[in-house]
Amino acid sequence: YSNFRKSVDSTGRRQYQVQNGPCSYTFLLPETDSCRSSSSPYMSNAVQRDAPLDYDDSVQRLQVLENILENNTQWLMKLENYIQDNMKKEMVEIQQNVVQNQTAVMIEIGTSLLNQTAAQTRKLTDVEAQVLNQTTRLELQLLQHSISTNKLEKQILDQTSEINKLQNKNSFLEQKVLDMEGKHSEQLQSMKEQKDELQVLVSKQSSVIDELEKKLVTATVNNSLLQKQQHDLMETVNSLLTMMSSPNSKSSVAIRKEEQTTFRDCAEIFKSGLTTSGIYTLTFPNSTEEIKAYCDMDVGGGGWTVIQHREDGSVDFQRTWKEYKEGFGSPLGEYWLGNEFVSQLTGQHRYVLKIQLKDWEGNEAHSLYDHFYLAGEESNYRIHLTGLTGTAGKISSISQPGSDFSTKDSDNDKCICKCSQMLSGGWWFDACGPSNLNGQYYPQKQNTNKFNGIKWYYWKGSGYSLKATTMMIRPADF
């Protein structure tokens, strides 16, 4: 009997089996394992993709395809030989005994073989076309690369030459810089030496000035003491002469009071006979702590303790709470005596405050308050003033009732802003108020429309920054 069946083996290859009586013939058809399946991005008969593969990859795949083709060819030849050699005997029997359906089986097998061969040929044609396409693309790429390489080489040459030029320039400039550095270092050295010499000179002069200041103060004091002693001697002589001329008078011994050595204010100094304006040492009430102040012994009968003075903008008045508390500046020029001393002094006796002002047009004015005192630090040195008279305005330019003192680091005003920062300087700001004698100093012709100048509204109006100011105090009973 004869029969025919198609099946797939365990490796997935197709096989054709022909059973003819006791003989069985199995044909294993080759599979194109080396070709990628259609799910691959490189389908065997797909259109070539745009992006070229790497050259080495293409060559390698070409070799693989050639091997497959060669294998297929060899296999076909083997199959042909096998059919010719081994089937001759059986073919005779088959030809004798074959029935019509086995012929059909053979035809089917042949057809299948032809189909397989045709498919392989088509695939090879596709691969050849791809290889040609790929080769052309690679050649074009190589050509482009060589052109680009030539361009790059030219650019590199140009850049190399530019770099050489720049290096030459660099070397030249480096040399110049080195030369200049040498000169500069020499000049710097010379300047440093000069600076050192000047510093030595300045320190010498400073010490000389300090000595001279001390001598001046001593001389002033001595002069005043001599004047007082002369005055006392004259009085004693006159007294003695009077006594001598009176025959009934009893002899008496003149007992001099012990010389006062410490003074709480300039009024005491004046009363002690020292009537020359200048710097004097004052002592804090109920303390041994001392402070230097300028005493005005000329204005309005003398005895004035100067607590503030502005004249040229040489001292910065935008200071801290501590500095305004303790005082700053120079009593010979611009200065602030110190809130603590003034508070203690005016808290013990009744004092008057006189404020002298000068504008840039040569005019002078003053305000006199018949009672002035500062509260203690716990009350932010709040100012208290009554009884205004004078020529610098009928209304007080220091807000009434008195405000607390404010500085850049201690905001105690009544403004939503920070007056001391906005207007500059420490002052008894309201919100911010009609005055600020500790404002920014502005020179002539730059002193109008100023928001932070030295202001006394009820004399010169808003925005006018004054030329000079002096605040001074004296006991009300002087």
Partner: nanobody
Framework: EVQLVESGGGLVQPGGSLRLSCAAS????????IGWFRQAPGKEREGVSA????????YYADSVKGRFTISSDNSKNTVYLQMNSLRPEDTAVYYC??????????????????????WGQGTLVTVSS
């Protein structure tokens, strides 16, 4: 240098209108309040109107309410005073002045005259038939 320049004054009949301008330089209107003041011969300078916060807050003296309108154009850094229904008693030199907007007493809305530190030269307004 802060400068304020007024313009727009002149002679007008009672019931007439004028528009005054105040051009500011050296300051920006964002940070300052601008006030209009007037001073008639032999009288104290008085506040007429003021503006701050880009027009968000305005002030008018009772004597000019309903007749005068203050406005500002920050792009031109200029403040205007539109004066309608003018009366002979409005005759005066009109000044504009500037004050830092923050210089306000707690709880207050407007500024005393002494807080205005920058002033213009003034422009004369005469209301007469």
């Amino acid at each position: 240098e802060v400068q304020l320049v007024e313009s727009g004054g002149g002679l007008v009949q009672p019931g007439g209108s004028l528009r005054l301008s105040c051009a500011a330089s050296g300051i920006t209107l964002d940070d300052y309040a601008i006030g209009w003041f007037r001073q008639a011969p032999g009288k104290e300078r008085e506040g007429v109107s003021a503006i701050r916060d880009n027009g968000g807050s305005t002030y008018y003296a009772d004597s000019v309410k309903g007749r005068f309108t203050i406005s500002s154009d920050n792009s031109k850094n200029t403040v205007y005073l539109q004066m309608n229904s003018l009366r002979p008693e409005d005759t005066a030199v009109y000044y504009c002045a500037a004050v830092p907007a923050g210089r306000l007493r707690y709880g207050e809305q407007w500024y005393p005259i002494y807080e205005y530190d920058a002033w213009g030269q003034g422009t004369l307004v005469t209301v007469s038939s």
